[in-house]
Amino acid sequence: EVEKTACPSGKKAREIDESLIFYKKWELEACVDAALLATQMDRVNAIPFTYEQLDVLKHKLDELYPQGYPESVIQHLGYLFLKMSPEDIRKWNVTSLETLKALLEVNKGHEMSPQVATLIDRFVKGRGQLDKDTLDTLTAFYPGYLCSLSPEELSSVPPSSIWAVRPQDLDTCDPRQLDVLYPKARLAFQNMNGSEYFVKIQSFLGGAPTEDLKALSQQNVSMDLATFMKLRTDAVLPLTVAEVQKLLGPHVEGLKAEERHRPVRDWILRQRQDDLDTLGLGLQGGIPNGYLVLDLSMQEALS
């Protein structure tokens, strides 16, 4: 039976190199000095270790740094970062943007993992603020990260970062976040022509005010119903039937299927029935002909 715990003669690792891939897992444990590993972490990435061998190396680092790894080691973790748990990462103090970039690069192309979320959280807390460089880095790697920020944090997002945002990255944003992001997107895309501008701004329109929707209605944009349904109710209500018809273009027929849902339902209640009838969609619930419409909100403002 093989019962070895000490490093076999001649196997003590002098440096981290390719010869270690031949080592058994127990030999890595017994023959690789943790301090040597820590100083030569940058070499690990170039060596085709198995996942289990990486687990052994992680175990050695854990024993050397029970309170958490120093940043000099963290920056060179490479693929070993994928072996870290959120609990491991919570022990770290990451302050260098270069360290953050190096670790985000390892996870590039994948969804934001709990490890990455924890790393970003630790980084932001370590820095004490969300500066422009940090946000540029985070939105470059994870455009969807925007929706995880509070409206207060979003206020410091530079408009230039908005260019990296894909429509699906805003799926989890709530109206309060879109209220902050929309003006930035408007600014970022302001020099684009009409149709290109609409393609880019469309995902952010959940934060658009009434006047911007009115302006869009004059540009033959043909907004789809999915986008229309995400608009702020208070921004849609003042739109006239003619403006909604121009805004939606051929998609206006979709209003019938959505007449019981917000914001369509609330908008219908504000329109004259004879105006709704001009659409020929059979929309019901508008203000009957001959009724006087009092704008109570205006009356309150005047008093």
């Epitope: 039976e1 093989v2 019962e3 897992k25 127990w26 198995t50 996942y51 289990e52 687990d55 175990h59």
Partner: antibody, heavy 121, light 109 residues
């Protein structure tokens, strides 16, 4: 004398759960990597997974999510929790010990006698 | 890593030299074990580290190879050797289907 004894097998309905135990005697289980292997009637050996001495677990790709290996060193016992069982999980389940301490590096030198799990309605 | 074992079965006589091969889909260095299993019994480790004889195993069993190609040889088949033999790679246990080979059944000719 070094020995492994599995228990907890039996008849279970599809969709059900079962926890198998493997009690070790004659050695300290905490010093060894311990694995589970199964064998369907008339078929070959099929690896389920193993747990290292530092409690890292490794599973066959088909076992991930449904099967969980754990150990209780104080009871000198290793466990296999099986969930959402299917008819094709019917097999003799063996627990086994690595030759040396730490990780699976060489092979399983000590095997239990096996416990039969039958998944049927 | 996939393990391909051949032949799936073979018939031989007592005293014959028997060779079973195992091929790995990628380099596993010397990280290979061989087992013997008899009906109704648990497997028994024969060879570890591709060529090292496990404790109590007769010297007529030997293993060779490294990298991707491995061989188990029984120099002179004995009556108690009629059984099924399996190889197992122990290089990697992450994201694999089954580290065991499909088995070779040795029967009496």
């Amino acid at each position: 004398q070094v020995q492994l004894v599995e228990s907890g097998g039996g008849l279970v309905q599809p969709g059900g759960s079962l926890r198998l135990s493997c009690a070790a005697s004659g050695f300290s289980l905490s010093s060894y990597a311990m694995g589970w292997v199964r064998q369907a009637p008339g078929k070959g050996l099929e690896w389920i997974g193993y747990i290292s001495t530092i409690a890292n677990t490794y599973y066959a790709s088909w076992a991930k999510g449904r099967f969980t290996i754990s150990r209780d060193n104080s009871k000198n016992t290793v466990y296999l929790q099986m969930n959402s069982l299917r008819a094709e999980d019917t097999a003799v389940y063996y627990c086994a010990r690595e030759i040396r301490s730490g990780w699976v590096d060489y092979g399983f030198s000590i095997w239990g006698q096996g416990t039969l799990v039958t998944v049927s309605s | 890593i996939q393990m391909t074992q051949s032949p799936s079965s073979l018939s031989a006589s007592v005293g014959d030299r028997v060779t079973i091969t195992c091929q790995a889909s990628q380099n596993i260095y010397s990280n290979l074990a061989w087992y013997q299993q008899k009906p109704g019994k648990a497997p028994k480790l024969l060879i570890y580290d591709a060529s090292d004889l496990a404790s109590g195993v007769p010297s007529r069993f030997s293993g060779s190879g490294s990298g991707t190609d491995f061989t188990l040889t029984i120099s002179s088949l004995q009556p108690e050797d009629f059984a099924t033999y399996y190889c197992q790679q122990v290089r990697s246990s992450s994201d694999i289907d089954n580290p065991f080979g499909t088995g070779t059944k040795v029967t009496v000719l």
